[in-house]
């Protein structure tokens, strides 16, 4: 959401979020690292092109023209400098002048050594318990952001991992239309549209960066779960990894796993939608997970096949009209899982990414809650790996990513909600090894053609 330094009455009233980097001569003397040429405080650029007509409530949602409902001035960093005050480097760069390349490797969780697996699980648990050093979350909408007295900013601290959960919740929540009115649910700033892959890519990149800083370990990388096994078992659901099934309750995680101790955030949907409040940092019940356990829906009791990935990578158009969850021959809609793996839309189909979520049959299968199950991270790194392979094969052809008339939040130049500093979909539509400082250690299945007899 916003840097702690900007969650103040002064910043919110002025609309300026341009924190100092090294203010030697007092507050406001080094906004955006301007004294060392790193950046400067400028007007926010926000996409104002039209969105599709399925969202009819313009003017009612803080996420419109993000982030202008809150701030209209922010840091614009020069060269490879980056961050809320231009104090860090763009992904893939390091050094005092941000002029040295770095490349981290995201690997298959199952290929890690025992020590590496243990380190990853411990790191996730640390992220769940560690207050985010930079960001705070809003607990009220913009009209109530200064509190009942108009002088008390309504923000809370939140842990690094719960921030990851909260940003996802905020991007998918319904539009509140007022007390006594039903909230509008046909809106989603991170799913069912072209921004699905770019949004989740940045989401992971932010968590990875936060965990690198938390650990002081620049090489730290998020592993992936290759969920395209075609199996009806969760191969990473073991106590040394993401937690096996509890013997006492088949919908819970084994007490031998640290994840059995995790408590979820953003579970009070009824309050948010009827009272107009936002999810806060309060933790609730445990993670629920019952892999392959949805007997009422046999089609989600088995994971995608390896060939599904090979097939989806042959869909050459990134997206197609109406740029929604009913698009046909759209790579994005195919990997998201609303089309079958060949790209054909079918309302009954749930494949690839969607199928992996639904297979988990619990917290991880509910959109507003899903990141509470840390398997979400691994599921999405694999989805991002598929995206990156598509970008490599098709030379990051952005021509079918619409500039306008996509669902709200999904236009090419839209600032992804609710990330800070503002970052557009375009910035994430690039090959990761050359542009974002990470690569995947992965072998892709080749398409097998059956020869007719």
């Amino acid at each position: 959401q916003f840097p702690r330094q900007c969650a103040t009455v002064e910043a919110l009233r002025s609309g300026m979020c341009c924190p100092d980097l090294s203010p030697v001569s007092g507050p406001g003397t080094d906004r955006c690292g301007s004294s060392s040429g790193r950046g400067r405080c400028e007007a926010v650029t926000a996409d104002s092109r039209p969105h599709s007509p399925q969202y009819p409530h313009d003017g009612r949602d803080d996420r419109e023209v993000w982030p202008l409902r809150f701030f209209n001035r922010t840091c614009h960093c020069n060269g490879n400098f980056s961050g809320h005050n231009c104090g860090t480097c763009r992904p893939g760069w390091r050094g005092a002048a941000c002029d040295q390349r770095v490349l981290i490797v995201r690997r298959n969780l199952l290929d890690l050594s025992k020590e590496e697996k243990n380190h990853f699980v411990r790191a996730l648990d640390m992220a769940k318990r560690t207050t985010h050093p930079l960001f705070v979350i809003a607990t009220r909408r913009s009209e109530e952001i200064l509190g009942p007295d108009g002088n008390t900013p309504q923000f809370e601290n939140i842990s690094i991992y719960n921030y990851f959960v909260w940003t996802h919740y905020y991007s998918v929540k319904k539009t509140f239309l007022g007390v006594g009115q039903e909230s509008f649910g046909e809106v989603d700033f991170s799913h069912e549209g072209p921004a699905f892959l770019t949004w989740h890519r940045y989401h992971l990149l932010r968590l990875e960066k936060d965990m690198q800083e938390m650990l002081q370990e620049p090489s730290f990388s998020l592993p992936y779960w290759n969920f395209a096994t075609g199996k009806n078992v969760c191969d990473i659901c073991t106590d040394d990894l993401m937690g096996s099934r509890s013997n006492f309750d088949s919908t819970l995680i084994s007490p031998n796993s640290v994840f059995s101790q995790w408590r979820v955030v953003c579970d009070s949907l009824e309050d948010y939608d009827t009272l107009g409040t936002l999810c806060n940092s309060t933790e609730d019940g445990p993670i629920r997970r019952n892999p392959a356990g949805n007997v009422a829906r046999p089609m989600v009791q088995r994971l995608p096949e390896p060939q599904d990935v090979a097939q989806c990578l042959e869909v050459g158009l990134f997206d197609t009209p109406p740029f929604y969850s009913n698009s046909t021959n759209s790579f994005r809609n195919t990997v998201e899982g609303y089309s079958d793996p060949t790209g054909k839309y079918d309302p009954a189909v749930r494949s690839l990414h969607n199928l992996a979520h639904l297979f988990l049959n619990g917290t991880g299968g509910q959109t507003h809650l899903s990141p509470n199950d840390p398997i979400f991270v691994l599921l999405h790194t694999f989805t991002d790996a598929v995206f990156d392979e598509w970008l490599r094969r098709y030379n990051a052809d952005i021509s079918t990513f619409p500039l306008e008339n996509a669902p709200i939040g999904h236009n090419r130049q839209y600032n992804m909600v609710p990330f800070w500093p503002p970052v557009t979909n375009t910035e994430m539509f690039v090959t990761a090894p050359d542009n974002l400082g990470y690569t995947y250690e992965i072998q892709w299945p080749s398409r097998e053609f059956s020869v007719p007899e």
């Epitope: 860090t88 480097c89 390091r94 050094g95 005092a96 040295q100 390349r101 770095v102 490349l103 380190h119 640390m126 560690t130 207050t131 690198q212 800083e213 938390m214 650990l215 002081q216 370990e217 620049p218 090489s219 730290f220």
Partner: antibody, heavy 121, light 106 residues
Amino acid sequence: EVQLQQSGAELVRPGALVKLSCKTSGFNIKDYFLHWVRQRPDQGLEWIGWINPDNGNTVYDPKFQGTASLTADTSSNTVYLQLSGLTSEDTAVYFCTRRDYTYEKAALDYWGQGTTVTVST
Amino acid sequence: IQMSQSPASLSASVGETVTITCRASGNIYNYLAWYQQKQGKSPHLLVYDAKTLADGVPSRFSGSGSGTQYSLKISSLQTEDSGNYYCQHFWSLPFTFGSGTKLEIK
């Protein structure tokens, strides 16, 4: 002036535990990560782990996991290293040292004078 | 990441130039520091980020390298340069040290 003042030498029995202290001055420990390093007699340097005094987070080299425990008291600007299940192999000088919170800077820039721990019957 | 440091020891005369090298088992992207330790004293930072001289360190010390290969060069040796030298990486946990180089001034 930045200083890291470590506690005095310790003579301990095998199997016992010892708690070493490192009192800092001249900087706010909440802005730094405090690391500990071991040096056995006539040997090189071995990294033990770090603590973030601001939140109590710790990371250890796997070979010290379970035997070393780092804690911090921000009110007194002091960090502690507790060693348990001591053997003669743990006879060494133990240094506390600091690293800038900006993890981009690869260095331990100030060091304590070291505490000698001797494990003997 | 393992750090291989060489030579284990060397001897040189005042005014000469010596080079100590550290090889990492993987790319550490310049996340490397060099320290000097005199007998019975604490280590002292010389170089960070592979090539940036720490405050107060004489300019006869210089760090270089990239990827997996790094070196510390000491030109116009002085008698006070005798001691042990260590490299340490900060790329991935644990942050291991090199085995050390003992420098003797003839």
